[in-house]
């Protein structure tokens, strides 16, 4: 028990990558707990993370139901134990999050180069089509399934021996580029959604170089 009053949550922040979506907030609770609710603009409020002492709540299960909807969350503060509440007229304290539209705002996760194959002076570079937590007909969709042609990949490549980078883009997950015979090249890719105004680009993938295990070479 105690007399510390319940305080409202603040700094509500969406953290989302490839639709894995977590709401974070402050403060760390002292003599209080939180329950989170999430809603679409036209929908009903659904409670999650009941009576928690965490300052984050995984809302992925809710947002993947329709990633093109705009969501709003709110965090309720309740007194723990026999602590007074500051809510007026018995109303619980809560704070609203900013709006969040997963399709437009989720961060693009760091891509991975799945493989590259050299045939003569051509190299085929394949980007792993990462699985998301978005479902359709009980199967998880890939990033490409969700974004379709809105998603492009940019390939950065350079000769092992030089610093000059070249670029190439694709609306699929594969690149076919020309290389100089007998030269080793290094590759890095980046996911991009050109139509976005925020979170347009992912971080670059780890660099992969020819002569390492991911490559195949055929004359």
């Amino acid at each position: 028990s105690g007399t510390t009053n319940t305080v409202a949550a603040y700094n509500l922040t969406w953290k989302s990558t490839n639709f894995k979506t977590i709401l974070e907030w402050e403060p760390k609770p002292v003599n209080q707990v939180y329950t989170v609710q999430i809603s679409t603009k036209s929908g009903d409020w659904k409670s999650k993370c009941f009576y928690t002492t965490d300052t984050e709540c995984d809302l992925t299960d809710e947002i993947v139901k329709d990633v093109k909807q705009t969501y709003l969350a709110r965090v309720f503060s309740y007194p723990a134990g026999n602590v007074e509440s500051t809510g007026s007229a018995g109303e619980p304290l809560y704070e609203n999050s900013p709006e969040f539209t997963p399709y437009l705002e989720t961060n693009l996760g760091q891509p991975t180069i799945q493989s590259f194959e050299q045939v003569g002076t051509k190299v085929n570079v394949t980007v792993e089509d990462e699985r998301t937590l978005v479902r359709r007909n009980n199967t998880f969709l890939s990033l490409r399934d969700v974004f379709g042609k809105d998603l492009i990949y940019t390939l950065y490549y350079w000769k092992d021996s030089s610093t000059g980078r070249k670029t190439n883009t694709t609306h699929t997950n594969e690149f076919l580029i020309d290389v100089d015979k007998g030269e080793n090249y290094c590759f890095s890719v980046q996911a991009v959604i050109p139509s976005r105004t925020v979170n347009r680009k992912s971080t670059d993938s780890p660099v992969e170089c020819m002569g390492q295990e991911k490559g195949e070479f055929r004359e």
């Epitope: 409020w45 659904k46 409670s47 009941f50 009576y51 309720f76 309740y78 723990a80």
Partner: antibody, heavy 121, light 107 residues
Framework: QVQLVQSGAEVKKPGASVKVSCKAS????????MHWVRQAPGQGLEWMGI????????VYAQKFQGRVTMTRDTSTSTVYMELSSLRSEDTAVYYC??????????????WGQGTMVTVSS | DIQMTQSPSSLSASVGDRVTITCQAS??????LNWYQQKPGKAPKLLIY???NLETGVPSRFSGSRSGTDFTFTISSLQPEDIATYYC?????????FGGGTKVEIK
């Protein structure tokens, strides 16, 4: 099997306190919330509050705020509900009930057998 | 607090009849509603969670549905062992609240 076993019936005088125990077995005690629900004779069910056994954090219905205290003993997988300043309206059967898994976090999937508390002068 | 208005408060039906109980929430509670069965002198038993999901081991003659703030609990074919009081319970808002109960009897 999963079960909750509660302490026996109590008769108390107005103004006194009562402490009811609920011993859990057959599952990992710390992984499930425990709730207390009461039922006055011939009446419906009334939620009193919740305790998280892993951290001991409690949340009470405002109606019972200041009069109820829920505690737990992880060494014996037991939760306790103490109600003070008893009055005749507190005469009821008191149940502990386990909160379900994450799928149904606030559905009460396992119940104790109930403890009858009679408040009479 | 959220009020859960359950109706009817009691009903009498014949074995094999379809029995329907409704619960209306005083405000939107999403699908955060559970149904319990309580037989005389016994603790309640969870039948349906999240408005329409059947708890493991519960006979399929029991079902639940939602339309907005109205929730329906149905026994498709009443059996003698279904004599009990049935309660709805919402958990979308603190504090958790129950409906007043519906007593089901056999004609």
């Amino acid at each position: 099997q999963v079960q909750l076993v509660q302490s026996g019936a109590e008769v108390k005088k107005p103004g006194a306190s009562v402490k009811v125990s609920c011993k859990a077995s057959g599952y990992t005690f710390a992984n499930y919330y425990m709730h207390w629900v009461r039922q006055a004779p011939g009446q419906g069910l009334e939620w009193m509050g919740i305790i998280n056994p892993s951290g001991g954090i409690t949340v009470y219905a405002q109606k019972f705020q200041g009069r109820v205290t829920m505690t737990r003993d992880t060494s014996t997988s037991t939760v306790y509900m103490e109600l003070s300043s008893l009055r005749s309206e507190d005469t009821a059967v008191y149940y502990c009930a386990r909160g379900g898994s994450k799928v149904a976090a606030l559905a009460f999937d396992i119940w104790g057998q109930g403890t009858m508390v009679t408040v009479s002068s | 607090d959220i009020q859960m208005t359950q109706s009817p408060s009691s009903l009498s039906a014949s074995v094999g009849d379809r029995v329907t109980i409704t619960c209306q929430a005083s405000q939107d509670i999403s699908n955060s509603l559970n149904w319990y069965q309580q037989k005389p002198g016994k603790a309640p038993k969870l039948l349906i969670y999240d408005a329409s999901n059947l708890e493991t081991g519960v006979p399929s003659r029991f079902s639940g549905s939602r339309s907005g703030t109205d929730f329906t609990f149905t026994i498709s074919s009443l059996q003698p062992e279904d004599i009990a009081t049935y309660y709805c319970q919402q958990y979308n808002f603190h504090p958790l609240t129950f409906g007043g109960g519906t007593k089901v009897e056999i004609k």
